[in-house]
């Protein structure tokens, strides 16, 4: 079925929501004053070999649990990330965006990445897809 303007708009809004969530996480942790940043950077994330289509979000979905574990280190009294809620929200968006009709086997790059590189990769992906929709 060809995408309608309303489905495109919905996809765009969901991608924008995903983008904002990822940027919020990145801004929250990627601060040179963050006491835990260096230790957070010791965690490794798998990066997609290719990420150009919505189905490739499968690769993000598979790394959400490790992401939540690292985010558990990022809380402070004045910075309430609420990792479980945040990851749950991202998971819902990812599932809607990639669809559940086709099962896609994610292919990962050989090199692992830090949380900052990982977030930047998926932020770039979201921005790229949004730009093709507008």
């Amino acid at each position: 079925m060809a995408p309608t303007s309303s489905s495109t708009k919905k996809t765009q809004l969901q991608l924008e929501h995903l983008l904002l969530d990822l940027q919020m996480i990145l801004n929250g942790i990627n601060n040179y004053k963050n006491p835990k940043l260096t230790r957070m950077l010791t965690f490794k994330f798998y990066m997609p070999k290719k990420a150009t289509e919505l189905k490739h979000l499968q690769c993000l979905e598979e790394e959400l649990k490790p992401l939540e574990e690292v985010l558990n280190l990022a809380q402070s009294k004045n910075f309430h990330l609420r990792p479980r809620d945040l990851i749950s929200n991202i998971n819902v968006i990812v599932l809607e965006l990639k669809g559940s009709e086709t099962t896609f086997m994610c292919e990962y790059a050989d090199e692992t990445a830090t949380i900052v590189e990982f977030l930047n990769r998926w932020i770039t992906f979201s921005q790229s897809i949004i730009s093709t929709l507008t």
Partner: antibody
Framework: EVQLVQSGAEVKKPGESLKISCKGS????????IEWVRQMPGKGLEWMGV????????YYNEKFKGQVTISADKSISTAYLQWSSLKASDTAMYYC??????????????WGQGTTVTVSS | AIRLTQSPSSFSASTGDRVTITCKAS??????????MNWYQQKPGKAPKLLIY???NLESGVPSRFSGSGSGTDFTLTISSLQSEDFATYYC?????????FGGGTKVEIK
């Protein structure tokens, strides 16, 4: 019981290599970072570096970078601190410690008993 | 690196005494409303033991006579009534910035 058990005391000559160990038990070893701390005779405590046993990712105190190597084998829940060429100034007590960083905190809640390293010709 | 200066470096006290140890940081160890300052106790030939974390939180199993306070650059460890098992060296530690650093230690001896 959560514990970190370190390898025994070592007496070495300058220029020799050495690898000391720290074995975790009573908890999920890959869920916590392991840090190494040096205490020279009659002195205070110095942080050396940290390893994430799950990923193998490390971060070192600039002072110790290139002087020591921190590694881990998650299959046997063990972290290591090694020297390729010991110096007399490496004579010290070395402790491993478990880092806790959830929530608003960052501290060492469990320590190994320490490994005494003596380097003398 | 953040320097931590403990005072006094050593002193003598009697059981039952109220003991206060201070730790002054060369710059603030606070981040977004939290103080990244911890206190450890070390006895001769033993590993350090965590007493207080995040400036004022008592570690599980540590007697309530130990307490911590402070924020920014000035912190205090207080032992409300010194017991015989409390004679040891106490270290403050900041975990706000790498490299983590420890104070020089305060040795509490029997008078």
């Amino acid at each position: 019981e959560v514990q970190l058990v370190q390898s025994g005391a070592e007496v070495k000559k300058p220029g020799e290599s050495l690898k000391i160990s720290c074995k975790g038990s009573g908890y999920a070893f890959t869920n916590y970072l392991i840090e190494w701390v040096r205490q020279m005779p009659g002195k205070g405590l110095e942080w050396m570096g940290v390893i994430n046993p799950g990923s193998g990712g490390t971060y070192y105190n600039e002072k110790f970078k290139g002087q020591v190597t921190i590694s881990a084998d998650k299959s046997i829940s063990t972290a290591y601190l090694q020297w390729s060429s010991l110096k007399a100034s490496d004579t010290a007590m070395y402790y491993c410690a478990r880092w806790r960083g959830e929530g608003y905190y960052a501290y060492y809640d469990v320590w190994g008993q320490g490994t005494t390293v003596t380097v003398s010709s | 690196a953040i320097r931590l200066t403990q005072s006094p470096s050593s002193f003598s006290a009697s059981t039952g005494d109220r003991v206060t140890i201070t730790c002054k940081a060369s710059q603030s160890v606070d981040y977004q409303g939290d103080s990244y300052m911890n206190w450890y106790q070390q006895k001769p030939g033993k590993a350090p033991k965590l007493l207080i974390y995040a400036a004022s939180n008592l570690e599980s199993g540590v007697p309530s006579r130990f307490s911590g306070s402070g924020s920014g650059t000035d912190f205090t460890l207080t032992i409300s009534s010194l017991q015989s098992e409390d004679f040891a060296t106490y270290y403050c530690q900041q975990s706000n910035e790498d490299p983590y650093t420890f104070g020089g230690g305060t040795k509490v001896e029997i008078k």
